[in-house]
């Protein structure tokens, strides 16, 4: 008895297609070995037609494929454009030769059934409409016109010219004539369902002189499009339902037993399982829209359907499009934490993965907002300035080639809690959803800056100190000057005198920064932070106001005072957390967006996209930096 299993009998008709699924036992060897589909000859030989090694026979060229699903322990043979010549005995199997483990499959392809010779065939999709043309002779012009549907014994009236309508066609069937043409009438049936499929007769007149025409109406369910996606990646369902439903509410649902459960619609309904990782985007006035789901889970696999109806719910007789989503657990996208925890006043460092082959892609970070159809406005990017409300507390650190970039958000409040996405303009599969949870702080922060009300006097020396606990002693401490293009890490003391300086006093566990002499350009936000190699940890921020000697020392409003200098990011990137878990961050990786998608995802205005090079700090140091000296404490 073979451990391989599949359908013993497959039956179809010419021109159709089949998908034959073969199941194999769950072993590592089986998952990785060659899969094949062969045809058995009279001699008992089995001739390979297609295999997972890439072999494709001439007779299958352009019409067949074989796909292995190791996570399901199955492989699928898809064969299109069937002919009667495909009828025969086959084997699906595993192994380096066709004598390996296998299963016998009988395929029968029949001729398309014959219809009466004068039958006109109309083929329509579910939910669409059909207009049946019924010609007649001029002498039957005054006579009654009708359309009926053939049943086993009789022909059941659909509609006639005396305005009789079958109850199941009320509001859907219209009988009419066009212009002055008295030799043809038309019947339009809208919102077609499977039950409308069948043979119809249209008739003008009665008795032997009546004009009759046979009609075969075929109502097709849309063939599901097969989508194969990796675990933790993203999928976009592109739904094109046509102009006739452009003004109706749109939905995406997932088949569940009898029903199709709505996941999201344009009326604001959203399944809680998809909170933070789904967007629905109307594309244009032609009924096109798309639904994007990030952070795919194993349980997201299934049969999806999009449609349109004023209720935002699936309705029979309305156009639909369908997909079968497979989620491959052997994912290239690394498994990271999808929940990041921070405390009020504290900070988080979020490591965003991207396709390492696309290190030069533009990196972005957006906040998912669930109102309306859901959207994700970009907050920061390698060429997108930090949004104003995040001034002084958000920066993106990129290190090309590492496969990770880091987003740091500090001065956390409970309002920051929510869902955020990491995305790039490269490989659209790599989009990561991170849930940020912010709890009320119950103790002092790990990093504290003194003085807290920092007002420096022009031309004088000014020092700020960052106090850190002993547990951070072995980690690298740094100061950086924040601008809306990033946080430019200040050079350490061995990079030459007359620079912004950073030093550390072991006994008092503090790292200081001295500005000497203070210049107007020194005004702005500064961050003190810790990191371990390229792994960024906690940060704290301070605004330094600069005043002239003659003026008082009142604190300048940070937002007004912020100088929007185009300082590029230091090429530093973080990939995992350090120190206290609740303040640290590693995201759950997901897939990236292309430029067009980013525009949609982010809703960001063009002016928020600066064109400077954010990849390097070379030639970007502040004009004031030459005035700074190093002081050791």
């Amino acid at each position: 008895k073979s451990p391989i299993f599949g359908p013993q009998e497959v039956s179809s008709i010419e021109g159709d297609s089949v998908s034959i699924t073969c199941y194999y036992p769950d072993t590592s060897v089986n998952r990785h070995t060659r899969k094949y589909w062969c045809r058995q000859g009279a001699s008992g030989m089995c001739t390979t037609l297609i295999s997972s090694n890439g072999y494709l026979s001439k007779e299958y060229s352009g019409r067949a494929n074989l796909i292995n699903f190791p996570e399901n322990n199955t492989f699928v043979i898809n064969i299109e454009q069937l002919t009667q010549d495909d009828t025969g005995s086959y084997k699906c199997g595993l192994g380096t030769s066709n004598r390996g483990l296998s299963f016998d499959v009988s395929l029968e392809v029949s001729q398309v059934p014959e219809l009466p010779s004068d039958t006109h065939v109309y083929t329509k999709d579910i939910g669409r409409n059909v207009t049946i043309e019924c010609p007649f002779k001029r002498e039957n012009a005054p006579s009654k016109k009708s359309l009926c549907k053939k049943t086993n014994q009789s022909c059941e009236l659909v509609i006639d010219s005396t305005e009789k309508v079958n109850p199941s066609y009320i509001g859907r069937a219209k009988l009419f004539m066009k212009g002055t043409d008295l030799t043809v009438f038309y019947v339009n049936i809208s919102h077609l369902t499977h039950n409308d499929a069948g043979l119809y007769i249209c008739q003008a007149g009665e008795g032997p002189s009546a004009d009759k025409k046979n009609v075969d109406l075929q109502v097709l369910a849309p063939e599901p499009e097969l989508l194969y996606k990796d675990l933790r990646s993203s999928v976009t369902f592109e739904c094109d339902l046509g102009r006739e439903v452009a003004n109706e509410a749109k939905y995406l649902c997932r088949m569940n037993k009898e029903t199709c459960d709505v996941i999201i619609n344009t009326l604001g309904k959203r399944d809680p399982d998809f909170e933070g990782r789904i967007l629905i985007t109307p594309k244009d006035d032609n009924g096109r829209f798309s639904v994007l789901i990030t952070g795919l889970r194993k349980e997201d696999a299934g049969h999806y359907q999009c449609g349109a109806h004023s209720s935002g719910l699936p309705q029979e007789g309305w156009p639909i499009q369908t997909w079968q989503l497979f989620v491959n657990e052997e994912s290239t996208i690394p498994n990271r934490r999808s929940v990041v925890k921070g405390v009020t006043g504290g900070s988080v460092a979020i490591a965003c993965p991207y396709n390492p082959k696309e290190s030069s892609s533009l990196k972005y970070w957006c906040r998912w907002e669930g109102d309306g159809n859901g959207h994700c406005p970009v907050l920061v990017g390698t060429q997108a300035q930090v949004q104003e409300e995040y001034e002084g507390r958000l920066a993106l650190f990129d290190q090309p080639g590492n496969g990770t970039y880091t987003v740091i958000l500090n001065q956390l409040t409970t309002e920051d809690a929510g869902f955020y996405w990491c995305l790039t303009n490269g490989d659209s599969r790599w989009r990561t959803t991170i849930e940020l949870q912010v709890a009320e702080a119950t103790r002092e922060p790990n990093l504290e800056v003194t003085p807290q009300n920092a007002t420096a006097v022009l031309g004088e020396t000014f020092t700020v100190s960052c106090h850190y606990p002993c547990k951070f002693y072995s980690q690298e401490k740094y100061w950086c000057k924040w601008s809306n293009k990033g946080c430019h890490i200040l050079p350490s003391h061995d990079e030459g005198a007359r620079q912004s300086s950073v030093s550390c006093d072991q006994s008092s566990q503090l790292v200081s920064m001295t500005l000497n002499p203070v210049s107007k350009e020194d005004e702005g936000w500064y961050w003190c932070g810790v990191k371990q190699g390229q792994t960024y940890g906690e940060t704290t921020a301070i605004y330094i106001a600069v005043e002239e000697r003659t003026r008082g020392s009142s604190h300048v409003n940070p937002t007004d005072a912020n100088a929007r200098a185009k300082v590029a990011l230091e090429e530093e990137v973080v990939d995992s957390s350090i120190s206290e878990k609740e303040n640290k961050a590693i995201p759950n990786p997901g897939p990236f967006a292309n430029e067009r998608e980013i525009q949609n995802v982010g809703d960001q205005a063009q002016e928020n996209r600066a064109s400077g090079d954010a990849g390097s700090a070379d030639g970007q140091s502040r004009s004031s930096s030459s005035k700074h000296h190093h002081h050791h404490h």
Epitope: F5, P7, V10, I13, Q324
Partner: nanobody, 131 residues
Framework: EVQLVESGGGLVQAGGSLRLSCAAS??????????MGWFRQAPGKEREFVSA???????????YYADSMKGRLTISRDNAKNTVYLQMNSLKPEDTAVYYC???????????????????WGQGTQVTVSS
């Protein structure tokens, strides 16, 4: 909610034949959008797969049979009557069991032998094969 009602069970001599029927009702969806099949449970044993029939569309279908009964079974269905049939030939005493009709709207993506994937089950019909 789909209701499944089995019939055709009974007492039969070894080597004899039976034709089981399962009538489906109560579905808003077309009958051909379901995978339908049969499982059986002998006294003191687990329920086991017997046969299944999946329709891809009005003209394409897939028939599955358990290895233990291969060559002795034929599954078919009458879409107009919303009924699935199981013709069993050359019956053996070990075929004695309660036979359950099953249905699922999940389509082609699941192993038809996996009983957890079937959303609807009939009450069962007893088949007894005497020697």
């Amino acid at each position: 909610e789909v209701q499944l009602v089995e019939s055709g069970g009974g007492l039969v001599q070894a080597g004899g034949s039976l034709r089981l029927s399962c009538a489906a009702s109560g579905s808003g969806r077309t009958f051909t959008s379901y995978t339908m099949g049969w499982f059986r449970q002998a006294p003191g044993k687990e329920r086991e797969f017997v046969s299944a029939l999946t329709w891809a569309d009005d003209s394409t279908y897939y028939k599955y049979y358990a290895d233990s009964m291969k060559g002795r079974l034929t599954i078919s269905r009458d879409n107009a009557k919303n009924t699935v049939y199981l013709q069993m030939n050359s019956l053996k005493p070990e075929d004695t069991a309660v036979y359950y009709c099953v249905a699922t709207g999940r389509g082609l993506t699941y192993d038809p032998r996996d009983r957890r994937k079937y959303d609807y089950w009939g009450q069962g019909t007893q088949v007894t094969v005497s020697s």
